[in-house]
């Protein structure tokens, strides 16, 4: 088949914690990213306060964070715990534009969700969220 | 409705699955008023790292 997957919905939004990072200029100063779940799709990084620039795509790595605390989630020695979270938003309607990070609907919803999570997990330790995916309920 | 799936990252040892879910559920009312998002059917689980190729995107709830 022709075509190549691009424009991943994999985005890391962060709360400004001082994680050391391996990033590229396209990362817009985002301190770290999680590799995309698309094996053939670049990772897209974006600050929660700005619109996603779908052209800023690249691969980057999880930083070597250090911590002596016992892990609360299965992981390697990255110093980071990851949690998968799923929920329904019952007062919104899915449409196909939620499959594309360059659309207004996707960006507005991602921004609201990102800001919401920054509010919820204000305590130190929250590094960010990534791999946002929307699907019909 | 819209189902949202995402991955949260925390510093190692700062939070567990139960607390992630509890804090999120406690915020649902404020989410409705502040962001006009009516949230339900919350599910939280650990993500092994590195992520598997299958990942969470194949889940259907």
């Amino acid at each position: 088949a022709s075509g190549s997957a691009s424009g991943s919905a994999s985005t890391l939004v962060h709360n400004g914690t001082s994680a050391r990072a391996t990033t590229t200029p396209a990362s817009k100063s985002t301190p770290f990213s999680i590799p995309s779940h698309h094996s053939d799709t670049p990772t897209t990084l974006a600050s929660h306060s700005t619109k996603t620039d779908a052209s800023s795509t690249h691969h980057s790595s999880v930083p070597p964070l250090t911590s002596s605390n016992h892990s609360t989630s299965p992981q390697l020695s990255t110093g980071v715990s990851f949690f998968f979270l799923s929920f329904h938003i019952s007062n919104l309607q899915f449409n196909s534009s939620l499959e594309d990070p360059s659309t207004d609907y996707y960006q507005e919803l991602q921004r609201d969700i990102s800001e919401m999570f920054l509010q919820i997990y204000k305590q130190g330790g929250f590094l960010g969220l990534s791999n946002i995916k929307f699907r019909p309920g | 409705s819209v189902v949202v799936q995402l991955t949260l990252a925390f510093r190692e040892g700062t939070i567990n699955v139960h607390d992630v879910e509890t804090q999120f559920n406690q915020y649902k009312t404020e989410a409705a008023s502040r962001y006009n998002l009516t949230i339900s059917d919350v599910s939280v689980s650990d993500v092994p790292f590195p992520f598997s190729a299958q990942s969470h995107h194949h889940h259907h709830h």
């Epitope: 088949a1 022709s2 075509g3 190549s4 997957a5 691009s6 424009g7 991943s8 919905a9 994999s10 995309s36 779940h37 698309h38 094996s39 053939d40 799709t41 779908a54 052209s55 899915f94 449409n95 196909s96 534009s97 499959e99 594309d100 990070p101 360059s102 659309t103 207004d104 995916k133 699907r135 019909p136 | 190729a53 299958q54 990942s55 995107h57 194949h58 259907h60």
Partner: antibody, heavy 117, light 107 residues
Framework: EVQLQQSGAELVRPGSSVKMSCKTS????????INWVKQRPGQGLEWIGY????????EYNEKFKGKATLTSDTTSSTAYMQLSSLTSEDSAIYFC??????????WGQGTLVTVSA | DIQLTQSPSSLSASLGERVSLTCRAS??????LNWLQQEPDGTIKRLIY???SLDSGVPKRFSGSRSGSDYSLTISSLESEDFVDYYC?????????FGGGTKLEIK
């Protein structure tokens, strides 16, 4: 490598129906959308509609409502499009295009439908 | 519906030449525009997504840009396999619509 395999060419009678398929392989995600597009011989492209695989969520171009019906089967990672009450205007190549982090990322090779008495 | 006016409808050019194809949108579509390439056998491949992002595996001689409501696909130095058909596609709002196409022919 992602592949979209569409079903073979169809020669059908006016007034009848035809159902074509679009099978995805080589991709780990089973949740994504499929768009369907029409191209008449020597002409441009027209969007027919969209279905999110494994759900009953669909969107249609008003022009094709009542003409096209989109369905899918998650277990076989296959999307289907049925065209009804066929006329010569429906003679065309029909493409499926799937999402992969963004819309219209991968395209099938097309299914030629010829409506002829 | 959003109209995409694609120009020129056909273009004759020489190997190595730089060419630009244009799509004008009738309404604001932001960056929600793709460029597609169609081979003579019908095969369609996406070249550019979100106005200016190059799909993986697409040669760097292809680039996309925007100026207001005008969207351009530029091929910096034509190669023999580039002489095919090109379409723009907007996905800002349903129904998604395509430009009329540009046939690129060898001079």
């Amino acid at each position: 490598e992602v592949q979209l395999q569409q079903s073979g060419a169809e020669l059908v009678r006016p007034g009848s129906s035809v159902k074509m398929s679009c099978k995805t392989s080589g991709y780990t995600f089973t949740s994504y959308g499929i768009n369907w597009v029409k191209q008449r011989p020597g002409q441009g492209l027209e969007w027919i509609g969209y279905i999110y695989l494994g759900s009953d969520y669909t969107e249609y171009n008003e022009k094709f409502k009542g003409k096209a019906t989109l369905t899918s089967d998650t277990t076989s990672s296959t999307a289907y499009m049925q065209l009804s009450s066929l006329t010569s205007e429906d003679s065309a190549i029909y493409f499926c295009a799937r999402s992969a982090g963004s819309l219209f990322a991968y395209w099938g090779q097309g299914t030629l439908v010829t409506v002829s008495a | 519906d959003i109209q995409l006016t694609q120009s020129p409808s056909s273009l004759s050019a020489s190997l190595g030449e730089r060419v630009s194809l244009t799509c004008r949108a009738s309404q604001d579509i932001g960056i929600t525009l793709n460029w597609l390439q169609q081979e003579p056998d019908g095969t369609i491949k996406r070249l550019i997504y979100a106005t200016s992002s190059l799909d993986s595996g697409v040669p760097k001689r292809f680039s996309g840009s925007r100026s207001g409501s005008d969207y351009s696909l530029t091929i910096s130095s034509l190669e023999s396999e580039d002489f095919v058909d090109y379409y723009c596609l907007q996905y800002a709002s349903s129904p998604y619509t395509f430009g009329g196409g540009t046939k690129l022919e060898i001079k």
